[in-house]
Interface confidence: medium
Amino acid sequence: HKCDITLQEIIKTLNSLTEQKTLCTELTVTDIFAASKNTTEKETFCRAATVLRQFYSHHEKDTRCLGATAQQFHRHKQLIRFLKRLDRNLWGLAGLNSCPVKEANQSTLENFLERLKTIMREKYSKCSS
């Protein structure tokens, strides 16, 4: 059973994202992983995509993230580009139209992405063995 090319793309994007440590990756997002025991894999991917979409829609033009220098501006634009790519690929894996995100718990975007990377690597190790 071959690993989906989308899964490889997601891991590659997550590797790039988790290398970036900026003020914007310290912003909080809904922690869908805090209580995900009764959630299917597809629902988890769908909900992760929803959280990411909410994040970049809200913070794409956030002045705290954009900063004042050309370097800060470029880094933030790159972050948003990676998040959009990740969102698109997660929707592809999920195959669901929509999913509820109602958790009250918060986590930093950085921790959220690290957790997602762990899940994706586990999935990759299963499908590649």
Epitope: K21, L23, E26, L27, T28, V29, Q106, T108
Partner: nanobody, 116 residues
Framework: EVQLLESGGGLVQPGGSLRLSCAAS????????MAWARQAPGKGLEWVSY????????YYADSVKGRFTISRDNSKNTLYLQMNSLRAEDTAVYYC?????????WGQGTLVTVSS
Amino acid sequence: EVQLLESGGGLVQPGGSLRLSCAASGFTFEEYGMAWARQAPGKGLEWVSYIVADGARTYYADSVKGRFTISRDNSKNTLYLQMNSLRAEDTAVYYCAKSLGRFDYWGQGTLVTVSS
């Protein structure tokens, strides 16, 4: 119940210094990034500085970079903001906040007035 109590504000001359403190309780302080924000009279809320949970990384608004230093003492559950080379435009109520993004918990604020 989460509580954040700021102190250290006051009247200072331009070019002077102040050190703000924020005593935190009701949550596991060392697990959360902490921020300072401020609100000048008649203006909106402005983010000032942020420090990650273990204190390893700090971030500053461009308006205070090089003049303000954020720090924390996790053993004392306390957040600090050292403010040097103060300017009239730094006059504001300063708030500490738990985490960034959704500032879900705020202190009551401490007033800093920079005037000669």
